[in-house]
């Protein structure tokens, strides 16, 4: 069966700024990636970005280079302390669409003891759903 | 087809606050960002903020916070802008747009909301 | 926060001409360059989004190219119906709006 993996790691230099890794275990082609904070989209979380392998990538504040790693695998900084920011406990979620899988989605935050420059390994987080 | 309704024209006296509305038809409303955009008599457009309406988060241009306050009502699929201890600086053509994300920042807009501040 | 310059702040051509608009951002944006329409009494009209790419259901007369902190915009065999504001936007991080170039015919 398919699986997402969802890495967040608080960055030592700047800590307000965060880096989430994402990343599909399966054998289809992704036709798109959303990324979404404080839970998943259409669960009251709010999107960061969605990439797309031909139209694009877009992403909103605080979210800033958000990219392809690889063929399955994205990452993205999110940056800044305002009000729109994100917390050491804020849960974030990668959904996948591919094919012949299906929507395959996972969520997770920054560990509770991880140190500036630590990051959670890359698990395979619960698959919240699978459409 | 996509649309976004907004509310009719205000006219209020400075000091006072407005609040302008924005319903939104034909797609779904919790997934796409709504902007708002002011646009002084003979001027450009200026951004004043985004709001998430599937978690209410927002986001505001330095220039506006504390004064525009975004909220959305889910179940009428419609977003509201508060303006607060308005001046005649406020007077202006208030559009709300939706980001269509990949299919583009500001895909559908509303027809623009007039708003007059004066004594 | 970056700003658009956008220029001419007017312009006037005949009809069957061509005109260009350019827009410069204070920093590279990637290429997130979207082009706008705008006549009196109607909300903006979105024509291109990511530098070059044509809205659906707009003629291809209108055309977008650029990169790095450079854009521009045309407007080839104009239509009466082309008279309007343009605006650029940029949409890389948040949003800023270019000052607007009013098209008129000659």
């Known amino acids: 069966t398919p699986e997402v993996w969802v890495q967040v790691r608080m960055e030592a230099t700047e800590l307000s700024s965060f880096t989430i890794r994402c990343g599909f275990l399966g054998s289809g082609s992704i036709s798109l990636v959303t990324v979404s904070w404080g839970g998943p989209n259409g669960a009251g979380g709010t999107t960061l970005a969605v990439l797309h392998p031909e139209r694009g990538i877009r992403q909103w504040a605080p979210a800033r280079q958000a990219r392809w790693e690889t063929q399955s695998s994205i990452s993205l900084i999110l940056e800044g302390s305002g009000a729109s920011s994100p917390c050491a406990n804020t849960t974030f979620c990668c959904k996948f669409a591919s094919f012949p899988e299906g929507s395959w989605e996972a969520c997770g935050s920054l560990p509770p003891s991880s140190d500036p420059g630590l990051s959670a390994p890359p698990t395979p987080a619960p698959i919240l759903r699978a459409d | 087809q996509v649309q976004l309704q907004q509310s009719g024209p205000e006219l209020v006296k400075p000091g006072t606050s407005v609040k302008i509305s924005c319903k939104a038809s034909g797609y779904t409303f919790t997934d796409y960002y709504i902007n708002w955009v002011k646009q002084r008599p003979g001027q450009g457009l200026e951004w004043i903020g985004w709001?998430?309406?599937?978690?209410?988060?927002?986001y505001y241009n330095e220039k506006f916070k504390g004064r525009a306050t975004l909220t959305v009502d889910k179940s009428s699929s419609t977003a509201y802008m508060l303006l607060s201890s308005l001046t005649s600086e406020d007077s202006a053509v208030y559009f709300c747009a939706r980001d269509g994300g990949l299919r583009g920042p500001f895909d559908y807009w509303g027809q623009g909301t007039t708003l007059t501040v004066s004594s | 926060d970056i700003q658009m310059t956008q220029s001419p702040s007017s312009l006037s051509a005949s009809l069957g001409g061509k005109v260009t608009i350019t827009c410069k951002a204070s920093?590279?944006?990637?290429?997130?360059i979207a082009w706008f329409q705008h006549k009196p009494g109607k909300g903006p009209r979105l024509l291109i989004h990511f530098t070059s790419t044509l809205q659906s259901g707009i003629p291809s007369r209108f055309s977008g190219s650029g990169s790095g902190g450079d854009y521009s915009f045309s407007i080839s065999n104009l239509e009466p119906e082309d008279i309007a504001t343009y605006y650029c936007l940029q949409y890389d991080y948040l949003y800023t709006f270019g000052g607007g170039t009013t098209l008129e015919i000659k």
């Open positions: 920093q590279d944006i990637n290429k997130y």
């Open positions: 709001i998430f309406p599937g978690s209410g988060n927002t």
